[in-house]
Interface confidence: low
């Protein structure tokens, strides 16, 4: 029997440029006399084109929603009502080339025709994008808050806030034509819910969805996001009711940033430069496309790719990369946002060089990628380290700790976290290698110990990046670098003159004198530890609650003792910068680690130090008896002290306590305590320090109180933030 | 409840390789909780613990066995296995596996029967 | 490596108590547990966590573990409680099992 034909919905989203008519301001306001008369018409011209071609049988509905520049270009979206099997042969491309024929047709045509009658479009200015019901219902919810701004070459745009009344607003910005626009939000409060959508096209087209970023993100105080062309909307919707807007917009059109580059690189290890998409730190435009090409002096290095929270992976080939797509040497991978470090290592095979091609390949982008380059050799890519497979690092050996996800740096290890004896493999502990007392067999323990050797896992590098033998040899009144860089920036780590935490006794004046009190409206919240003249670091969870994420909320203290009261020792600072490391990850408390800078330096006296930061291959070897301090709760659940207490804690072999912690426990972390428990940290004590006591008798920070199941409980121990593993980006930000 | 069953060859010669199973039922070896460990009793001595896995490949071994030792879980079939390479009569014994607490306290608890392996020519 | 040290032989009177001793440096840190084995029997837990029983086991079973020394009492202790008994703890990476007391019920 006869069966009706399925119609379908086909929506399309465009613009066209029409040549005998101006912009002019009016047209930005909707509620204008001019705007409804030129809607009437420039609508009834949009209908009359499409319906002089074969897609009239199918016209439903459409609408010109706005103006622009150039010298007039109309916004507009319309319905074609199509038979379900030719769905797939209207596609934005085919209807506007079907539109495109007709008014080329028309162009010198002497007859009258309706939609020319007023209107001179111009046929190389039209553009039809594929859109949906979604789209229009989207765009129509913003109508009622429709911003169209124009900015100029050499010009900044700050756009005008939303408005208080309306849930959704829309900013419609344009450009000159060969340009593109550069938008720049700085979120301006602590906490918000609002949503700011941005979009490569001048309405919220979900497939021309550029990035979307949401409630004040203290990750990213600043986004600049580029569009591909002159052209971008952005859609902002209300997310709790504020008075002040969350946030500042503004934007610039800037000229194409040309991202081909050719190379050479230097006869020489490790990084040599950084190649960046255009505009970095601003998020890749849709359509980008970078071509690096990178010369090797010789087959006997790699090329090697050092990102930074980006990773490349390998995709099925029929699948998009959605956050940018790169090929090298063939080889197609997909980028991927990560919190960790991550190296591409390209074994190098022919003198050509080689090529590596970044493009974004779809509309939806990302923070700008930026990678420094340089070589390693091929046949020892990490020199007395463990090249870790997963992620292209080079990671310390049989330390006893598995850096590797896979942990293969602790598999087959002769000697885990010993020195390994020349003459017969036997192991003997890492603080009798050079102590002038020789234990291996033939004393090989104490050669070269006042030279030079290869750099390796517990070796000190130097500043000239000479390594020393010695393990630790950082401040312990002998120079052991030949540069004696391992006795500088030694004003630390001593305690004053003095006569949370769980089973622990109470600390006298000047005892720690780098321990710090964090305080919000006159309350202890957190430990931390002074660490130089102007930084504290604490615990990054200390600011996992948008609410405590503001640095004006902060007052540290150092030099205290008793929470209730003040003594002439005892200063307080406010907080001029808060930076939480950017690999942070609250779930798993990875990275769990912040820096306060304070708003003077301190003045030291026997009250306030900075403690002793370790370098990155400092041993704190399990066995090891350390203090843990703090004015955290005394019980689990119960209030915090009013007396700094200290306890001393055992530090704790990596296996074991990942065991406990059922395999969470990451590279970045340290445990310390006891298996039957009773001393340990406490809520309160979060991200005050852990230290070890050097036989010089100077204090090194070995952690940071991060977390555990419970306070003091057997089986479970107290995991720390292990300074060791974060300690090159304390370094960074504090130098 | 659970139980764990060894098998595998009662006599093996000198220089050959021991190969035991233990098979677990009323319970999953894949059980975060715990690990799995094999012990070792030589007539009329004491207990001698062998090694220890963990469902996802974590093993430890005793330092004076660990270049013979290798344990493997095969987690759809339920059970443990132990391979010691280059035996000799000093390996006469008999081989216990038991379920261990899984967070190093460490006590082992149910037992298998244990099955007793004699090396000889 | 790590011993553990146990006394060869106990011998007590029944319903006396017979304490058994397992000694090893700073076992007091760690935790011990206690296995009895009958004559053609696996091993059977009788302590674990220094102090604590398994469902099953008597209550005239106790132990402690402090300083260098864990401690198996049995108090009123009868002819059944005839066994070898071995003490167990970890040190680092390893198990470790005392030599065994034989325990004897005249």
């Known amino acids: 029997g006869y069966k009706a034909e399925v119609m379908v919905s086909q929506v399309y989203s465009g613009s066209l440029r029409v040549l005998n008519r101006h912009f002019s301001q009016d047209l930005t306001r909707r509620e204008s006399s001019a705007f409804r008369s030129e809607t009437a018409k420039a609508q009834k011209m949009l209908k009359e084109l499409i319906t002089s071609t074969r897609l009239g049988t199918y016209y439903n509905s459409s609408s010109v929603y706005s103006f622009g520049e150039g010298p007039l270009t109309c916004f507009f979206w319309f319905i074609l009502q199509i038979p379900e099997h030719r769905r797939l042969m209207l596609s934005p491309e085919v209807v506007q080339a079907l539109l495109v024929e007709e008014l080329l047709s028309t162009v010198n045509s002497s007859a009258a025709v309706p939609y020319r009658a007023e209107y001179e479009v111009d046929p190389e200015g039209l553009v039809i994008l594929e859109a949906s019901v979604k789209d229009i219902a989207a765009l129509n919810s913003t109508l009622g808050c429709y911003r169209y701004s124009y900015v100029g070459q050499g010009q900044v745009l700050r756009l005008k806030g939303p408005d208080h009344l309306a849930s959704s607003c829309l900013w419609h910005l344009q450009g000159p034509k060969d340009l593109m626009l550069k938008l720049r939000l700085e979120w301006t409060l602590a906490e918000c819910r609002d949503r700011l959508a941005m979009y490569d096209v001048a309405g919220p087209l979900e497939k021309r969805l550029i990035t979307s970023v949401y409630g004040c993100s203290r990750q990213e105080p600043v986004v600049e996001v580029l569009a591909s062309g002159a052209i971008m909307a952005v859609v902002w919707k209300k997310g709790l009711h504020s008075y002040y807007d969350p946030f500042v917009l503004s934007v610039q059109p800037v000229v194409f940033q040309a991202c081909e580059v050719n190379l050479t690189l230097d006869n020489r290890l490790d990084s040599q430069g950084v190649l960046s998409t255009p505009y970095f730190p601003s998020y890749y435009s849709p359509q980008t496309h970078c071509s690096w090409h990178l010369t090797v002096p010789s087959l006997d290095y790699g090329l090697a790719l050092w990102f930074d929270a980006y990773a490349l992976r390998r995709q099925k080939y029929d699948l998009p990369c959605t956050q940018g797509q790169w090929t090298i040497q063939n080889r197609r991978l997909c980028g991927l946002r990560i919190l960790q470090p991550y190296a591409e290592r390209i074994p190098v095979v022919a003198t050509a060089g080689i090529t590596i091609n970044f493009t974004s390949q779809i509309s939806l982008t990302g923070p700008g990628v930026r990678v420094h380059y340089g070589l390693y050799n091929q046949s020892d890519p990490c020199p007395g380290e463990f090249l870790c497979s997963v992620n292209g690092l080079c990671v310390p050996a049989c330390d006893g700790v598995k850096d590797c996800p896979n942990g293969l740096d602790e598999r087959n290890c002769v000697c885990r976290a010993t020195f390994q004896c020349k003459e017969d493999s036997t192991c003997i502990s890492l603080p009798k290698v050079c102590d002038g007392q020789p234990d291996c067999l033939n004393g090989s323990d104490e050669e070269q110990c006042q030279e030079g050797v290869p750099c390796g896992t517990f070796t000190f590098q130097c500043e000239d990046r000479s390594c020393v033998k010695k393990p630790n040899p950082q401040c312990d009144g002998r120079p052991d670098c030949r540069d004696g860089s391992d006795e500088e920036h030694c004003d630390c780590g001593l305690q004053g003159p003095s006569s949370r935490i769980v089973g622990g006794a109470v600390s006298s004046e000047g005892e720690w004198p780098w321990q710090a009190s964090l305080q919000v409206r006159g309350r202890h919240i957190c430990g931390g530890a002074l660490i130089a003249d102007r930084w504290v670091i604490t615990a990054a969870h200390c600011f996992q609650e948008d609410s405590m994420a503001s640095t004006v909320l902060w007052t540290v203290f150092l030099g205290k003792v008793w929470q209730n009261s003040r003594w002439p020792g005892e200063v307080s600072f406010k907080v001029s910068r808060l930076l939480l490391h950017p690999y942070h990850e609250e779930d798993s408390h990875d990275y769990d680690v912040a820096l306060l800078q304070l708003d003077h330096p301190v003045v030291r006296s026997a009250a306030v130090r900075p403690v002793c930061l370790p370098a990155r291959s400092h041993f704190f070897e399990p066995g090891l008896h350390c203090w843990i301090t703090g004015w955290g709760a005394l019980r689990e659940g119960g209030p915090i002290s009013n007396a700094l207490q200290k306890v001393d804690v055992q530090l704790i072999p990596q296996d074991l306590c990942s065991e406990v912690y059922r395999y969470q426990v990451t590279p970045r972390m340290l445990c310390a305590g006891y298996r039957k428990g009773k001393k340990d940290a406490c809520q309160g004590d979060s991200g005050g320090p852990l230290v070890c006591k050097a036989l010089s008798g100077r204090w090194f920070l070995a952690g940071l109180v991060s977390w555990g199941l419970g306070c003091g409980r057997p089986n479970y121990f107290g995991v720390y933030t292990r300074i060791t593993g974060v300690i090159s980006w304390i370094q960074q930000v504090v130098t | 409840q659970l139980q764990l069953q060894e098998s595998g060859p009662g006599l093996v010669k000198p220089s050959e390789t021991l190969s035991l199973t233990c098979t677990v039922s009323?319970?999953?070896?894949?059980?975060?909780?715990?690990?799995w460990g094999w012990i070792r009793q030589s007539p009329g001595k004491g207990l001698e613990w062998i090694g220890s896995?963990?469902?996802?490949?974590?093993?430890y071994y005793n330092p004076s066995l660990k270049s013979r030792v290798t344990i493997s879980v095969d987690t759809s079939k339920n059970q443990l296995s132990l391979k010691v390479n280059s035996v000799t009569a000093a390996d006469t014994a008999v081989y216990y596996c038991?379920?261990?607490?899984?967070?190093?306290?460490?006590?082992?608890?149910?037992w298998g029967q244990g099955t007793l392996v004699t090396v000889s020519s | 490596s790590y011993e553990l040290t146990q006394p060869p032989s106990v011998s007590v009177s029944p319903g006396q108590t017979a304490t058994l001793t397992c000694s090893g440096d700073?076992?007091?840190?760690?935790?011990v547990c206690w296995f009895q084995q009958k004559p053609g029997q696996s091993p059977l837990l009788v302590m674990y966590?220094?102090?604590k029983r398994p469902s099953g086991i008597p209550e005239r079973f106790s132990g402690s573990n402090s300083g260098n020394t864990a401690t198996l009492t049995i108090s009123g202790t009868q002819a059944l409680d005839e066994a070898d008994y071995y003490c167990?703890?970890?040190?680092?990476?390893?198990?470790?099992f005392g030599g065994g007391t034989k325990l004897t019920v005249l």
């Open positions: 038991a379920r261990q607490d899984g967070f190093r306290t460490g006590w082992f608890d149910p």
């Open positions: 009323g319970g999953a070896i894949s059980s975060s909780n715990y690990f």
């Open positions: 896995m963990y469902y996802t490949g974590i093993t």
């Open positions: 700073k076992l007091g840190d760690n935790y």
């Open positions: 966590q220094d102090t």
């Open positions: 167990q703890a970890w040190d680092s990476r390893t198990v470790v």
